[in-house]
Structures are given as structure tokens and as C-alpha cells.
Interface confidence: low
């Protein structure tokens, strides 16, 4: 548990910026296994290695996350540090773990936020926690007392997402990542449904 | 190795507040969380809360709401709990310690590395 | 809140004995589950995670079980380093909650 994210954020720390940089112009254009998103462009050249291995882990879960990090490095000719994730790979039986549904497939059926509207606006409980991990980075002070001054958790939530239409992807990810911490069994729910 | 060394003993009146460290080595501070647990004399473990370093995101036990206050200085690799409005209630040893988390999996949140523990004392 | 109930809350044994503790939580935890252990004016030591982990340098005689709501740890053959107060702590609902801990001492 946890051993393939930090091996995957050690080879990628690993690299200089340089090969970092082409690390992902190659991750935009390497086959995926059906039913998974490719990790959009802009987003992606943006971010640094600890960046890139949560999004490889979101996206792609962690034994898949680790083959597709080995397959990149492979690739660029980097056999060493491939070979090292293959290592780890083995050790922690990630192979097992392969799941065969991505957690998250962005290019087929839009981000989970938008997919789980209605599902997160009956079941949220938790929308202080929810709006304090959001606070500044995503919500703005007015939008964020704007959401605090509704009175149920519905109406909380119904306010929140009048806000989902202006966010890209980073936001949806923030709002994602916060409903991870706070609510995990609602949204292994929803990814399961 | 991975260790979390805290603060030393705290003396304290009611009414008063505390700050207590909890220093990080021999890992990557910024992608791991960091958790506060209390322990009273002779009493079980209770999880105040967690902070995540790197984002400054916090969750707190509702039962700690208003009494403790979670940062971390990415820089020092060093993580703070202020304590505030002490009570006899609050004298216990508190501890940090680490959780591996990722963005997908909850399972992540044990504690793998505990801190050394901070005892803090509130007399009058 | 999650409770967790833990037992026994003491508990005797023998050297060579085989231990079993056990935690039920008040709702299924998805196996969210870790053992700690904790000696005198010692910080807690992590023994098992995801509720079957060995955590990193823990003697193979301990392991973990269970589902749903139901978790164990086993001590297979006790050692006199064994003595100690064990806890559960189920870490996949905010917030997360300990058991009331076991101390397990030498007959």
C-alpha cells in the first residue's frame, strides 16, 4: 500500500527538467488500455513531479499508474529507473490490483463532479468540511460565505455547485480530492454505481 | 531514517495557549499528511485531526473545533498544533504522526510513523 | 461517529500462547482498519494496516483479519516483548476513531 505512488514519485523526481518535460509530451501521446482518459495537455505540462504522480495515481489508479510510468521511462531509454519500478511493481503484487474500470475516465464520461450532481447534493453531510478544504483555492471569500449561508446541507451543496460551470478541471479535481477525505464510502459508492 | 521529533514539555495556565512542533526527517514531507492524537494519563488514543502539508488542507475531529489549530512550514518540514483556551482537560501527551495518502484511496490514512509525543501539562 | 469496541479490555497469557483481539465497528469499515501498539511512556508503534498489512519490521507472529465490520489481530506465539496495550483505529470515515485499547500482559 503506497509503495507504487512513492516509487513512481521517486523515478520522476528522479529525472532532470528536461527529461521531465518529455516524459510528459510522451505520456500525451502513449497507447492507453481502453476506457481510460488521457490526462489533459495544459494541465499537464504545468505540473511538477508530486503533481504528476497524484494525477497518475487519480487517474489511472496505482498499478496502472506504475506500468504506464515504466512503459514512458522504457521509452525514453531509461531502463534503470524502469527496471526499478518494475521491482516495486513485483514486491507489492500491484499487478493483482490492476483494475479493470478506471477511477476516473474523463474522455469518455466527464468528470465525476459533473456525473454525481444530483447523487452529491441529496448525500453530502459534510459541506463546512467540504467548503474549508476549497476556501481560497477554488471558492472565492463571497463564494464561499455564499454557500456557508444557506441553511441545509442540500441547499449548501445546490449553491456550491452554481459555481461548477465556471471551474476547469484543476477545481473539479480540488472538489474530488475534498470529497475523498471527507465522505470516502460516498464516493466509492458513486464510482462503483 | 523517517523519524518526527516534537517539542519538549509544556507548562501551562487555563486560559492559556500552546504550540507544539512536530519535525519531520529522512522522508519528503510534502507527500505524506500529518495527523495530532491525544492521549490522556492512563487513557486511550483520540484523533484531534490531520493536515495535509503541501496544500494546507485540514480536517479536524468536531470535538476539537475551536480548541486546536492545525499548519505545517513546508520549508522546515515542520508541522504545529496551537492549543488554545487551556483547561485541566487538555493535559495529556499529544503526538504526531504520518499517514501515506493519495488522492484515491482512503486507505492510505493509518499511521505509519509516530512523533515522540509532547506532554503538556495545564496547572494553575 | 464510527465506534469502534474493542475486546477484551485486559487480558493474561502465556508465553507461546496464541492471542486473538478483537475490534467491531459500529458500520462497515471496508477493511479501513490498522493495529498499533504501545508500550509505557512510548509513543504507538504500527503493526498491521488495511486490516491484513504487515506494517514495515513487524515480526511475522502478528496478522490481521476480518471484513466488514469485524477485525482481529493475532499473535501466534506470544513473546515476553509482546506485553503491551494494543489499538485499533478505523481510518475511512472522518472522524477517525480508536477502540478503547487491550492490555495484554504475561500469565
Known amino acids: 500500500m503506497g509503495r507504487a505512488r512513492d516509487a513512481i514519485l521517486d523515478a520522476l523526481e528522479n529525472l532532470s527538467g528536461d527529461e521531465l518535460k518529455k516524459f510528459k509530451m510522451k505520456l500525451l501521446t502513449v497507447q492507453l488500455r481502453e476506457g481510460y482518459g488521457r490526462i489533459p495537455r495544459g494541465a499537464l505540462l504545468q505540473m511538477d513531479a508530486i503533481d504528476l504522480t497524484d494525477k497518475l495515481v487519480s487517474y489511472y489508479l496505482e498499478s496502472y499508474g506504475l506500468e504506464l510510468t515504466m512503459t514512458v521511462l522504457r521509452d525514453m531509454g531509461l531502463q534503470e529507473l524502469a527496471e526499478q519500478l518494475q521491482t516495486t511493481k513485483e514486491e507489492s503484487g500491484a499487478v493483482a490490483a490492476a483494475a479493470s474500470v478506471p477511477a476516473q475516465s474523463t474522455a469518455r464520461t466527464g468528470h465525476f463532479v459533473d456525473q454525481h450532481r444530483q447523487a452529491l447534493i441529496a448525500r453530502v453531510t459534510e459541506v463546512d468540511g467540504v467548503l474549508d478544504a476549497l476556501h481560497g483555492s477554488v471558492l472565492t471569500e463571497g463564494q464561499y460565505q455564499a454557500v456557508r449561508a444557506e441553511t441545509t446541507s442540500q441547499d449548501k451543496m445546490r449553491k456550491l455547485f452554481s459555481f461548477v460551470p465556471s471551474w476547469n478541471l484543476t477545481c473539479k479535481d480540488s472538489l474530488l480530492q475534498a470529497l475523498k477525505e471527507i465522505h470516502p464510502y460516498l464516493v466509492m459508492d458513486l464510482e462503483q454505481s | 531514517q523517517v523519524q518526527l521529533q516534537q517539542s519538549g514539555a509544556e507548562l501551562a495556565r487555563p486560559g492559556a495557549s500552546v504550540k507544539l512542533s512536530c519535525k519531520a526527517s529522512?522522508?519528503?514531507?510534502?507527500?505524506?499528511?500529518i495527523n495530532w492524537v491525544k492521549q490522556r494519563t492512563g487513557q486511550g488514543l483520540e484523533w484531534i485531526g490531520k493536515?495535509?502539508?503541501?496544500?494546507?488542507?485540514?480536517h479536524n475531529n468536531e470535538n476539537f473545533k475551536g480548541k486546536a489549530t492545525l499548519t505545517a512550514d513546508t520549508s522546515s518540514s515542520t508541522a504545529y498544533m496551537d492549543l488554545r483556551s487551556l483547561t485541566s482537560e487538555d493535559s495529556a501527551v499529544y503526538f504526531c504522526?504520518?499517514?501515506?495518502?493519495?488522492?484515491?484511496?482512503?486507505?492510505?490514512?493509518?499511521?505509519?510513523?509516530w512523533g515522540t509525543g509532547t506532554t503538556v501539562t495545564v496547572s494553575s | 461517529d464510527i465506534k469502534m469496541t474493542q475486546s477484551p479490555s485486559s487480558m493474561y497469557a502465556s508465553l507461546g500462547e496464541r492471542v486473538t483481539i478483537t475490534c467491531k465497528a459500529s458500520?462497515?469499515?471496508?477493511?479501513?482498519l490498522s493495529w498499533y501498539q504501545q508500550k509505557p511512556w512510548k509513543s504507538p508503534k504500527t503493526l498491521i494496516y488495511?486490516?491484513?498489512s504487515l506494517a514495515d519490521g513487524v515480526p511475522s507472529r502478528f496478522s490481521g483479519s476480518g471484513s466488514g465490520q469485524d477485525y482481529s489481530l493475532t499473535i501466534s506465539s506470544l513473546e515476553s516483548d509482546d506485553t503491551a496495550t494494543y489499538y485499533c483505529?478505523?481510518?475511512?470515515?472522518?472522524?477517525?476513531?480508536f477502540g478503547s485499547g487491550t492490555k495484554l500482559e504475561i500469565k
Open positions: 504522526a504520518r499517514s501515506p495518502y493519495a488522492f484515491y484511496s482512503s486507505s492510505y490514512w493509518y499511521f505509519d510513523v
Open positions: 529522512g522522508y519528503n514531507f510534502t507527500t505524506y499528511g
Open positions: 493536515i495535509y502539508p503541501r496544500s494546507g488542507n485540514t
Open positions: 458500520q462497515d469499515i471496508k477493511s479501513y
Open positions: 488495511y486490516a491484513t
Open positions: 483505529l478505523q481510518h475511512g470515515e472522518s472522524p477517525f476513531t
